[in-house]
């Protein structure tokens, strides 16, 4: 048998946010139901994780031997602390789209570990704020965006923006 440390060396995690409790659940991406040491995990999920607090999970299973895999869960900031904002200026709304993620609340997570990504059509931007210019008037554009914490996606949003009519004579 392999050690659990080896077997789960490359385990990945998805973070799911509960807006009512303001707590995260970490979903462990494994094929079998594992045990989580002191942390109880049901159906490979570790519940009630506080934003921006590290949690250590000891992963074991009867298919592997000691030592267990120690997984550090680096819990992201609360999702409600981020808002996708349309920053397009009214006078330029016929040919311009502006979108930015606003941090309406502070949090204790390291901002260095946060990555923003926008995809509008086939254009990809790794920025917190984007401005698309020289667009077609009266066209519909879809922009998908996501925020990652330590390369784990923890929230996403989409905006469908229709550019205004062009000015007469343009």
């Amino acid at each position: 048998k392999p050690t659990c440390d080896e077997k789960y060396a490359n385990i990945t995690v998805d973070y799911l946010y509960n807006k009512e409790t303001k707590l995260f659940t970490a979903k462990l991406n494994v094929n079998e139901n594992v045990q989580c040491g002191n942390n109880t995990c049901t159906n490979n999920e570790v519940h009630n994780l506080t934003e921006c607090k590290n949690a250590s999970v000891s992963i074991s299973h009867n298919s592997c031997t000691a030592p267990d895999k120690t997984l550090i869960l680096d819990v992201p900031p609360g999702v409600e602390k981020f808002q996708l904002h349309d920053c397009t200026q009214v006078e330029k709304a016929d040919t311009t789209i502006c979108l930015k993620w606003k941090n309406i609340e502070t949090f204790t997570c390291d901002t260095q570990n946060i990555t923003y990504r926008f995809q509008c059509g086939n254009m990809i931007f790794d920025n917190k704020e984007i401005k698309l210019e020289n667009l077609e008037p009266e066209h519909e554009y879809k922009c998908d965006s996501e925020i990652l914490y330590n390369n784990h996606k923890f929230t996403n949003a989409s905006k469908i923006i229709k550019t205004d009519f062009g000015s007469p004579g343009e």
């Epitope: 790794d126 917190k128 401005k131």
Partner: antibody, heavy 119, light 113 residues
Framework: EVQLVESGGDLVKPGGSLKLSCAAS????????MSWVRQTPEKRLEWVAY????????YYPDTVKGRFTISRDNAKNTLYLQMSSLKSEDTAMYYC????????????WGAGTTVTVSS | DVLMTQTPLSLPVSLGDQASISCRSS???????????LEWYLQKPGQSPKLLIY???NRFSGVPDRFSGSGSGTDFTLKISRVEAEDLGVYYC??????????FGGGTKLEIK
């Protein structure tokens, strides 16, 4: 190491122009809003310009509006302050400072660069 | 514009004593989102300002717990429970609620009696 380094300060005559630079390193510059703050010889701190992370939004107090222009080059990790029609009251130490968003705080400051406006 | 008035201008203290600095805004700096964006910065001689407190009472990381902030509406206070030599310098309050018209207080110089 997270660092901001200002440069470009000089002695300039009233009515003259000057461009300050702030080189950022050690962090994802394009994710941070940035500001210029100055300190007068009397040691008063005054906020003079603000720019959002992507350069979309800029703000100025009335004292410098129309004379100062803040800009940034995220590819070069550099913040700028173009100052024109300079007055003697613009004499100060100019600091650049980062602020993750408008509702956050100035958590990193540069060491400053000195601007003296005098004939 | 929001005017931030600090008192006293100069505060002579003995090491180990408590120090208290007041900051008053000319109008309420409670934002419509319910938060109050009042910050305190310390500038030591020959250095740039450093953040101590944000949102009235939250200590920034690495700031000793002898520093505490309090207040609401228009009246705010920074307290240092036991002044140490490294605390000497000029303290500035700052309001960030009326975005983007940020304003600093005039400063309070903490010095040895």
């Amino acid at each position: 190491e997270v660092q901001l380094v200002e440069s470009g300060g000089d002695l300039v005559k009233p009515g003259g122009s000057l461009k300050l630079s702030c080189a950022a390193s050690g962090f994802a510059f394009s994710n941070y809003d940035m500001s210029w703050v100055r300190q007068t010889p009397e040691k008063r701190l005054e906020w003079v310009a603000y720019i959002s992370s992507g350069g979309v939004s800029t703000y100025y107090p009335d004292t410098v509006k129309g004379r100062f222009t803040i800009s940034r080059d995220n590819a070069k990790n550099t913040l700028y302050l173009q100052m024109s029609s300079l007055k003697s009251e613009d004499t100060a130490m100019y600091y650049c400072a980062r602020r993750y968003d408008v509702w956050w705080y100035f958590d990193v400051w540069g060491a400053g660069t000195t601007v003296t406006v005098s004939s | 514009d929001v005017l931030m008035t600090q008192t006293p201008l100069s505060l002579p203290v003995s090491l180990g004593d408590q120090a208290s600095i007041s900051c008053r805004s000319s109008q309420s700096i409670v934002h419509s989102n319910g938060n109050t964006y009042l910050e305190w910065y310390l500038q030591k001689p020959g250095q740039s300002p450093k953040l101590l407190i944000y949102k009235v009472s939250n200590r920034f990381s690495g700031v000793p717990d002898r520093f505490s902030g309090s207040g609401s509406g228009t009246d705010f206070t920074l307290k240092i429970s036991r002044v140490e030599a490294e605390d000497l310098g000029v303290y500035y309050c700052f309001q960030g609620s009326h975005v983007p018209m940020y304003t600093f207080g005039g400063g309070t110089k903490l010095e040895i009696k």
